[in-house]
């Protein structure tokens, strides 16, 4: 059934959304939109009335802040305001997520699982050097200046490369080859400089002062997530608590519901641009 | 004690396929690339391609791109596949670990840029 | 892609006496230098690192110097064992993304 407006509404020039309402189309006002809005010495037929002039300023139209979610584009109606959607999106403001695992839509490796609650089709886990809601966003982890003394970072994808300046040495530059000159670490570990004496920085496994002696490799708890370590002769194995993955047990296999709604970049396809 | 040993190489006829494996013991496989070098009669070294073993990532030179593929088929071991060899491919292909390194609170691990780790080599002979 | 350039390509020298080889990279590496030794019928075995970084159980009477694009690896006090064929080595990343290695073509040291 038709809405019933409030008694006398103008037919012609007002509208109404809910009964009893009367709302004016633009150039009209009153409460039963009959008073056609003066523009001789207004800027804009459009707002609320001011104080000091009884003339109209602008207010906000129905696309200011655009209410139109995930990249759809507003344009005003006569009654309201009307959302045009990226592809993968629908509702009346492009709230609603049509895309799920299925379409591929986690860019550069990102893995992809099915959302908790019925608002979120799907949510993207990005590798390291990833970000965004579908893993389409490049992290700049050189801007956090990681190498050391002044040693040029390169971030190569899938991790850091520190060039370092004359006199330093070290994945990140960290060691000053004064005091680590002619000296050296067993089993990949590098040397630290220390007030005229050297010490080792042992790779993974290794201790002591040149770094030749097998350490316990869960000494320094690699499992996360509550995951349990055991150490065997090739390194370490971590054994996830329920419901997380990964070999350091990193990624939950059913991660919380998200309330934040992924956007899918408009005009991608599915698909992963390798770096 | 550390070690890395290939297998699979020996007389190939061109135009066929190539499977390489390097097996690794001893160490940690994780934060380390394995990475394969070839080294041709009386030439220098010629690295191929390397696997990050923590994500899976390949780079590979551009020359090998599209006929040398790198894989990690297990915890401990990674391999080489080579298709439409010529004469031009007899080497001795090499194994190699280049370690990446890991700091607590830091962004990524850190490349090494060099290789700390070989193995004894296979050889391939591509003849007819 | 960046090319090493060794010289010499072979450099005879006496037990006892001093060896210099030299590397050249095709544009700036800073310190990202490696040095390997290589004998008949082994593989590569690395030397040093970051350009003057002696690996474990190296003799220190291995050195290495150099920074940019000119780089050195000297022997001194020969020895016989020292008679091998040495490449330098460094990493590059291009700005297409691509990330890689590159050998030197080699220097053979013959120790009389």
């Known amino acids: 059934a038709p809405l019933v407006c409030r008694a006398g509404c103008s037919p012609e020039h007002g509208f109404c959304e809910q009964p009893g309402e009367c709302r004016c189309l633009e150039g009209w006002t009153g409460p039963l939109c009959t008073v056609p809005v003066s523009t001789s010495s207004c800027l804009s037929p459009r707002g609320p009335s001011s104080a000091t002039t009884g003339c109209l300023v602008p207010g906000p139209g129905p696309c200011d802040g655009n209410p139109c979610a995930n990249g759809g584009s507003c344009s005003e109606t006569p009654r309201s305001f009307e959302c045009t959607c990226p592809r993968g999106f629908y509702g009346l403001r492009c709230e609603v997520s049509g895309v799920t695992c299925a379409d591929g839509p986690c860019f550069n490796g990102g893995l992809c699982v099915g959302g908790a609650d019925p608002d979120s089709a799907y949510i993207c886990h990005c590798p390291p050097g990833f970000q965004g809601s579908n893993c389409e966003k490049r992290v700049d982890r050189c801007s956090l200046q990681p190498c050391r003394n002044g040693g040029l970072c390169l971030d190569l994808g899938h991790a850091l490369r520190c060039r370092c300046r004359a006199g330093f040495a070290g994945p990140r530059c960290e060691h000053d080859l004064d005091d680590c000159a002619g000296r050296a670490c067993a089993n990949g570990g590098t040397c630290v400089e220390g007030g005229g004496a050297h010490r080792c920085s042992c790779a993974l496994g290794f201790g002591g002062r040149d770094c030749r002696e097998r350490a316990d490799p869960c000494a320094a708890r690699p499992c996360a997530h509550g995951g349990r370590c055991y150490a065997h002769f090739s390194g370490l194995v971590c054994a996830c608590a329920p419901g997380y993955m990964g070999a350091r047990c990193e990624f939950p296999v059913h991660p919380d519901g998200a309330s934040a709604l992924p956007a899918a970049p408009p005009g991608l396809r599915p698909g992963d641009p390798q770096r | 004690q550390e070690q890395l040993v290939e297998s699979g190489g020996g007389l190939v006829q061109p135009g066929a396929s190539l499977t390489l494996t390097c097996k690794a013991s001893?160490?940690?496989?994780?934060?380390?690339?394995m990475c394969w070098v070839r080294q041709a009669p009386g030439k220098g070294p010629e690295w191929i391609a390397c696997?990050?073993?923590?994500?899976?990532?390949a780079y590979s030179a551009s020359w090998a791109k599209g006929r040398f593929t790198v894989s990690k088929t297990s915890s401990t071991a990674v391999t080489l596949q080579v298709t439409g060899l010529t004469a031009a491919d007899t080497a001795t292909y090499f194994c190699?670990?280049?370690?990446?390194?890991?700091?607590?609170?830091?962004?990524?691990?850190?490349?090494?840029?060099?290789?700390?780790?070989w193995g004894p080599g296979t050889l391939v002979t591509v003849s007819s | 892609d960046i090319v090493m350039t060794q010289t010499p390509a072979s450099v005879e020298a006496a037990v006892g006496g001093t060896v210099t080889i030299k590397c050249q990279a095709s544009?700036?590496?800073?310190?990202?230098l490696a040095w390997y030794q290589q004998k008949p019928g082994q593989p590569p075995k690395l030397l040093m690192h970051?350009?003057?970084v002696l690996t474990s159980g190296v003799p220190s009477r291995f050195s290495g110097s150099g920074y940019g694009t000119e780089f050195t690896l000297t022997i001194s006090d020969l020895e016989c064992a020292d008679a091998a064929t040495y490449y330098c080595?460094?990493?590059?990343?291009?700005?297409?993304?691509?990330?890689?290695?590159?050998f030197g073509g080699g220097t053979e040291v013959v120790v009389k």
């Open positions: 190699a670990r280049s370690p990446y390194y890991t700091y607590g609170g830091a962004p990524s691990a850190y490349a090494s840029g060099y290789f700390n780790l």
């Open positions: 001893g160490f940690d496989f994780t934060s380390n690339a």
């Open positions: 696997i990050y073993n923590d994500d899976g990532s």
């Open positions: 544009e700036n590496i800073y310190n990202s």
């Open positions: 970051d350009a003057s």
């Open positions: 080595q460094s990493d590059y990343y291009s700005t297409g993304g691509s990330y890689g290695f590159a």
